[in-house]
Structure formats: structure tokens, C-alpha cells
Interface confidence: medium
């Protein structure tokens, strides 16, 4: 999906208002500075591409993030403020219908959410610069 035509200001507002709280709650007892940020992004569409990938694409050591509250809110925000986004996600959603039991938060998942926090902060900084 091409995030170029999203309403970035609205996405920022949703993040500041609610998604950030869910990310921080998930990270309770740790913080983004506890992990090295290895993922970065250069502009707003690129940041959203990376955020989508880290939030919704399962990795071998962290498969369950898409079911977390912050992920559900991220999905709703992107569907609301990125034209045509929800249509591109229908196939991906159906592939996830086989629900797994929620796993205990692993260190790898914490690391991944830490990367997400870094990407969101980068997204906001690029927004402040009005690139």
C-alpha cells in the first residue's frame, strides 16, 4: 500500500491521543531506550510503511502483536485516514482468522514494540518539520 495520500495530521493526533498509551502500557517496566533502534524511516509514508510491517507482519520470534490493543487501534487509524487502505487489508485479515492463544510477552516482542515506538517518534518528528 502507498501511504502517500494519508492524512498525516489526523494519524498523528490518533497516535498522541491513544496508540502511544497502549504501546507504553505494553512496554510497562521497560522503555524504548532499553533497546537499540535498528529500524528507521526517512519520511512520513516510509514511516507508516515500516510501522505497518512491524505491527502486522508476524516474525518467527514475535507472532502475536497484531492482536494487541495498539495494533487494533493502528489498523483503525490507517483505515480511517489512508484512502483505500482497508480494502488492501481484507485478504491479510482473512489469513489471520485462525486465532492463536495469546502468548506471554517475550523479550523479542518487547524489542519489536520498542522499534515501533521509535518509528512513531520519527513519524512525528518528520511531521513537525512539515517535509
Amino acid at each position: 500500500y502507498d501511504f502517500t495520500n494519508c492524512d498525516f495530521e489526523k494519524i498523528e493526533a490518533d497516535y498522541l491521543r491513544t496508540i502511544s498509551k497502549d504501546l507504553i502500557t505494553y512496554m510497562s517496566g521497560t522503555k524504548s531506550t532499553d533497546f537499540n533502534n535498528t529500524v528507521s524511516c526517512s519520511n512520513r509514508p516510509h514511516c507508516l510503511t515500516e510501522i505497518q510491517s512491524l505491527t502486522f507482519n508476524p516474525t518467527p520470534r514475535c507472532a502475536s502483536l497484531a492482536k494487541e490493543m495498539f495494533a487494533r487501534k493502528t489498523k483503525a487509524t490507517l483505515a480511517l485516514w489512508c484512502p483505500g487502505y482497508s480494502e488492501t487489508q481484507i485478504n491479510a485479515t482473512q489469513a489471520m482468522k485462525k486465532r492463536r492463544k495469546r502468548k506471554v510477552t517475550t523479550n523479542k516482542c518487547l524489542e519489536q514494540v520498542s522499534q515501533l515506538l521509535g518509528l512513531w517518534r520519527r513519524f512525528i518528528r518528520t511531521l513537525l518539520k512539515k517535509q
Epitope: A13, R17, I24, K31
Partner: antibody, heavy 120, light 108 residues
């Protein structure tokens, strides 16, 4: 421009009740977690409690000294936050601020405050 | 319950750098915010998320946070910076905790 305006403060006797209001404008009130914070004369800031947005279930949390005596509610149709204070004690005397929460649990907008004096 | 400790007062010469500390057990694992409050006025957020500045806050204000201490740094202090400063952090038991406040005096 974000604006928060508190009202309803005044003098009340110990054991009495008071209801504070906070009128919000300049933002989509229903989307935000809203708080009450108080400051006793010459003292520091003390968090009283908050109410989450409806999308976050609209639940409330309270600081230990006011739990069971104070109730926070909101009317999103009127863009108004409320603090119902019952069984008031002299130590509840303070300026009461309403505040909007944003980003990592910080308060980015505050009202001007309303003074509540509990005295016999 | 979680506690945040601040010095009661800090003095700084006009144009010099002021540092206000906020101590708490493993505070580095929490996000810390700083508020400025002038007499008779409501608090104003000057730093959030350890080191981020809201729009309208001068670059002279900065923050850091690691270990057991968070620090608010005000460089090139001005007379208008004289105020009470409060740190705040979210603790998962006490929800929202404020430090006791620090009175900043700008000398000269």
C-alpha cells in the same frame, strides 16, 4: 485553541459536597482522557483522578486519598468534565485543575483552576 | 507507592545553565514530563517523554532521564524562567505521580 474552564468551586463545610465542572473547547473532547489535579495552598501538584475516553471504555481511576468519596464523569455531548466531591475534609482544600492528557501520560493543556475551601 | 524527589530550590545566575533533578527508583524505565508553574497560574508542560518539547517551548529547555534520575536543563536562564518546576511520571500502581516541586530562582 484548546481551552479548559473550571467552575463550581467555593466554601463548603466538612462533610459537605460540591460538584466541579470543566467546560472544554477547541478540540474533540470525546477523544481524550481527562483528569483532575489539585494543589493545596502553598503545596505541590497532586493527581486526583481521571476518566478515559469512551473508545478506551470510559473507565475511571482515583488517587488513594479521594477514592470512594470523589466521582469523575463526563458528558461528551456537552464537552464537559465533572468532579463530584462528597464527604469533604479540610485537607481537600485546594485549587482544582482539569487537564487533558496526551502522549506518554503527560498533561498538555490545563484549565485556570477553581478554588475549593473546606472549613467550618 | 512510587515517589519522585526534587530539590526544594535551585538558583542560577542570569544567562547560565540551571539543572533541576527528579529522583525515583528506576525512573529511567518511565517516561518523565516537566511542568513550569508561575505564581497564580496553571502549570505549563515544558518537556514530555523525557526530552521532547511541545510547540512554543524554547530550545533552551531540554530533558534527560536514565537510571534513578531525570534532569530538566534550562540553558541561558532568563528572568522569565523563574517559577516552580514539577516532574511527573506514570507509575503502574499509582497511575500519575508528581515530584514535590522545585523553586527556580534566577539571580542578577
Amino acid at each position: 485553541e484548546v481551552q479548559l474552564v473550571e467552575s463550581g468551586g467555593g466554601l463548603v463545610k466538612p462533610g459537605g459536597s460540591l460538584r466541579l465542572s470543566c467546560a472544554a473547547s477547541g478540540f474533540t473532547f470525546s477523544d481524550y482522557w481527562m483528569h483532575w489535579v489539585r494543589q493545596a495552598p502553598g503545596k505541590g501538584l497532586e493527581w486526583v483522578g481521571h476518566i478515559k475516553s469512551k473508545t478506551d471504555a470510559g473507565t475511571t481511576d482515583y488517587a488513594a486519598p479521594v477514592k470512594g468519596r470523589f466521582t469523575i464523569s463526563r458528558d461528551d455531548s456537552k464537552n464537559t468534565l465533572y468532579l463530584q466531591m462528597n464527604s469533604l475534609k479540610t485537607e481537600d482544600t485546594a485549587v482544582y485543575y482539569c487537564a487533558r492528557e496526551i502522549y506518554y501520560y503527560a498533561f498538555d493543556s490545563w484549565g485556570q483552576g477553581t478554588l475549593v475551601t473546606v472549613s467550618s | 507507592s512510587y515517589e519522585l524527589t526534587q530539590p526544594l530550590s535551585v538558583s542560577v545566575a542570569l544567562g547560565q545553565t540551571a539543572r533541576i533533578t527528579c529522583s525515583g527508583d528506576n525512573i529511567g524505565s518511565k517516561y518523565v514530563h516537566w511542568y513550569q508553574q508561575k505564581p497564580g497560574q496553571a502549570p505549563v508542560l515544558v518537556i514530555y517523554g523525557d526530552n521532547e518539547r511541545p510547540s512554543g517551548i524554547p530550545e533552551r529547555f531540554s530533558g534527560s532521564n536514565s537510571g534513578n534520575t531525570a534532569t530538566l536543563t534550562i540553558s541561558r536562564a532568563q528572568a522569565g524562567d523563574e517559577a516552580d518546576y514539577y516532574c511527573q511520571a506514570a507509575d503502574w500502581v499509582d497511575f500519575y505521580v508528581f515530584g514535590g516541586g522545585t523553586k527556580l530562582t534566577v539571580l542578577g
